[in-house]
Interface confidence: low
């Protein structure tokens, strides 16, 4: 008997209170199916029901977490049903408070290098899951290290490629609640850098300004970058602007920093919309210094 294929949309990780669509596809074209849940709490809305094409399940509660299979109608089988489909594990998030996700040494990772993702919590989670946005396959399951202050896991990821870059979140769970997850950590953007040639960075009116004076940093390149990212050393996050084609054939973005009070080392990167987590080499660092201010960074 042909096994049908069960899938979950938008994915297998579902926030408590949200909905998930379970779709059972038969290669033979039969669109009626039954659903069963293999473990955990029973889900009465599945019992003795025939679904057509798909089933919108929700709003989900922790009781919906577990392993699902479907059987499609199969008139040529003795039972009238196909063999059970592949298993789909639905994980429900929001059951525990969120962990924190950090990148060491930082979220900008040179192509080919390794980054350590650290997920930690003051809750003693024995298991952590690492999930990349836009990926439908199951999250990566990691064993947590328990300690007095809570729990953590370190995951070494590399060598870095555009395929590994993206927006990551982690979740915590405890052994006996395998499919009930914490709320997601705040998102962490892991970016692979060094894929394209470096842009140029300059300052107007210049890299040395009076305290309170306006300064604009311009990032430009002959590469067809859609977006430029400006980062300041020792600061998380970056400014992001769309590139504009200039008369001289360069693609440029101007970052108005406004009235500056503190200096710092700035770098910029270029990237393409189609690959938002893959950036160029960094520009040469541009030290911006502020005079008439006792504090220089």
């Amino acid at each position: 008997q042909d096994k049908p294929f069960l899938s979950a949309w938008p994915g297998t990780v579902v926030s408590e209170g949200q909905h998930v669509t379970l779709q059972c596809r038969s290669r033979l074209g039969f669109n009626e199916f039954s659903l069963s849940k293999e473990d955990g709490m029973p889900v009465p809305e599945l019992y003795n029901r025939i679904f057509r094409n798909s089933f919108l399940m929700g709003p989900v509660t922790p009781a919906h977490a577990g392993t699902y299979r479907c059987c499609s109608s199969h008139p040529h089988s003795p039972t009238g049903w196909s063999a059970p489909s592949n298993p789909v594990v639905i994980m429900v998030t929001g059951v525990h408070r969120k962990p924190s996700l950090l990148a060491h040494p930082g979220p900008l990772v040179k192509s080919g290098e390794t980054v350590i993702l650290q997920c930690w919590s003051d809750v003693r989670f024995e298991r952590f899951l690492l999930h990349r946005e836009g990926i439908t396959e199951d999250p990566l399951r990691l064993v947590g290290q328990l300690h007095d202050a809570g729990s953590q896991v370190n995951y070494s990821m590399g060598p870095m490629t555009p395929a590994l870059a993206g927006t990551y979140r982690c979740f915590g769970s405890v052994t006996h609640l395998p499919y009930e997850l914490s709320a997601p950590s705040d998102p962490l953007d892991i970016v692979v850098v060094g894929l394209y040639g470096k842009p140029s960075l300059s300052a107007q009116p210049g890299p040395t300004v009076q305290a309170g004076e306006n300064v604009t940093l311009s990032c430009s390149s002959r590469s067809l970058f859609d977006i430029y990212h400006l980062s300041r050393e020792a600061e998380a996050g970056e400014l992001r602007l769309t590139a504009v084609l200039r008369v001289n054939g360069t693609f440029q973005a101007n970052f108005p920093l406004g009235p500056v009070t503190h200096g710092g080392n700035y770098r910029c990167f270029g990237s393409f919309r189609a690959l938002p987590h893959a950036w160029s080499d960094p520009s040469d660092p541009l030290p911006v210094s502020v005079t008439g201010n006792s504090r220089h960074l």
């Epitope: 955990g40 009781a63 577990g66 525990h96 003693r124 052994t175 006996h176």
Partner: antibody, heavy 121, light 98 residues
Framework: QAYLQQSGAELVRSGASVKMSCKAS????????MHWVKQTPGQGLEWIGY????????NYNQKFKGKATLTADTSSSTAYMQISSLTSEDSAVYFC??????????????WGQGTLVTVSA | SMYASLGERVTITCKAS??????LSWFQQKPGKSPKTLIY???RLVDGVPSRFSGSGSGQDYSLTISSLEYEDMGIYYC?????????FGGGTKLEIK
Amino acid sequence: QAYLQQSGAELVRSGASVKMSCKASGYTFTSYNMHWVKQTPGQGLEWIGYIFPGDGGTNYNQKFKGKATLTADTSSSTAYMQISSLTSEDSAVYFCARSGYYGNYEGFAYWGQGTLVTVSA
Amino acid sequence: SMYASLGERVTITCKASQDINSYLSWFQQKPGKSPKTLIYRANRLVDGVPSRFSGSGSGQDYSLTISSLEYEDMGIYYCLHYAEFPYTFGGGTKLEIK
């Protein structure tokens, strides 16, 4: 139907160790956490910790770290708890209790009948 | 201890030190016996437990209600929170016939 059979009462000298057992039947031993709980008239019920026989992973209440050691023998579907350096404060009834596979929604789904430990001077 | 008459509605309460997200169980224990789980996840009745038992609550405050007390309901009732480690039991409430 899951069933947990605990070993018999123990009378032990102060300073010695005691190892009690909890034999599981009626379910897959390696798929469920086995918790241990202490009961005394003075302190009521206290959670000691648990072992996951599937991989031997343990999680202890800090209060019992170094005092209790949890182990499991998958070949005989038996969980063990050893209590060391016994004092009169360790005189209690000790229960093993199995969690639910999914969700520990049940808190502790099944309980053993308890093992009475009496520590003598 | 708590005293109640047969047929009476009885409510026992349990307060957690923080929000435990309904990870709370109720147990009944009779002298010389092991505890018996009645309610899990704050309000879900264990199979085989009479429907006169019910649980409610959220956040930090939870309660166990017996809608009509029967003689066999005498015993000590404990709550357990299992939202995170270490799991913690309440001190117990002894329910006796008035």
